[in-house]
Amino acid sequence: MSITGISPITEYLASLSTYNDQSITFALEDESYEIYVEDLKKDEKKDKVLLSYYESQHPSNESGDGVDGKMLMVTLSPTKDFWLHANNKEHSVELHKSEKPLPDQAFFVLHNMHSNSVSFESKTDPGVFIGVKDNHLALIKVDSSENLSTENILFKLSETHHHHHH
């Protein structure tokens, strides 16, 4: 799965919440960021994430799409120079400081499984998605396409505004 362009095709600043409307929040602790899944108090501000969308060529063209076999990949950055990374060994989702070009672990295939929700599949481990486990984000293996609707891998994006990249 190769990214077809070095710059994103579009970018959005959005807050991220679970299918059950819990918020994804990011806290700086001991010089590293922790990711939490929690209920926010009524007037508490939601953390924002910059989602950068990249076009990617599908790895195989067995579908007969030829050059049209494109997917959307996203990177998620809650604060400058930090991106969500898939740690496939530990089945965890971590925030790491990175420089561009970002490593493959920072890219996730975008799925719209339902009209108002998205899922993020690890680029480096197909079939493994960002999901919610014990009030944290984790990597969750999804066995078949039927299980793509399981609520713990579904997220809602509440767009706050468009991000003009140059």
């Epitope: 095709i9 579009t10 959005y12 599908h58 579908s63 007969g64 799409d65 049209d68 076999g69 494109k70 997917m71 959307l72 295939v109 975008l110 799925h111 719209n112 499984m113 339902h114 009209s115 998205v118 396409s145 793509l148 609707s149 767009e159 505004h161 468009h162 991000h163 003009h164």
Partner: antibody, heavy 122, light 107 residues
Framework: QVNLLQSGATLVKPGASMKMSCKAS????????VSWVKQSHGKSLEWIGE????????NFNKEFKDKATLTVDKSTSTAYMELTRLTSEDSAVYYC???????????????WGQGTLVTVSS | IIVMTQSPKSMSISVGDRVTMNCKAS??????IAWYRQKPGQSPELLIY???NRYTGVPDRFTGGGYGTDFTLTINSVQAEDAAFYYC?????????FGGGTKVELK
Amino acid sequence: QVNLLQSGATLVKPGASMKMSCKASGYSFTDYWVSWVKQSHGKSLEWIGEIYPNSGANNFNKEFKDKATLTVDKSTSTAYMELTRLTSEDSAVYYCTRGPYYYSSQIIFAYWGQGTLVTVSS
Amino acid sequence: IIVMTQSPKSMSISVGDRVTMNCKASQNVGNNIAWYRQKPGQSPELLIYYASNRYTGVPDRFTGGGYGTDFTLTINSVQAEDAAFYYCQRIYNSPPTFGGGTKVELK
């Protein structure tokens, strides 16, 4: 190559219902959202709604929520749209369309069927 | 609902001309715009998406630009096959809406 083949033109009476089809070929049908678009004679385009064949999930333009029903038959790679309680306002060409991306609907219409003309008249 | 307004409604041009048409969104849509060409008696075809990205196989005489609320489609050196209606469309968010179209005729 990607092809969306729609059913033929239909003349229907006011108050009746009709169901049109869109047979997809040349790609993995379940992996792409399918949208439907209306074009009244000499007019612009209106998005009706979309369906994801893999899960059957759909998303509608509020204006068409009570007018259109979207379904798919995965075994024949065919999408269907049924229109109910037809009036002269529903006389139009209806297109089925597909986006450029696997798995993800950005509501971009990269491929179009040839259109189905629906005429509502007594 | 975001309203897309296209201008001019029609234009008459000659083969080889350079032509620019406009599309205005009623509120900020970022770069979430696509452009389509619809030749007489045919289905629309995608030209540009995300404001400035040419779709696969689209000739490089077509160029899209703009951000926020104001967008343009430019055709450098118009060909006879470019006589058509051109529609802009807001993408990404539901419901997507189309502009009323710009008709390009050849003199």
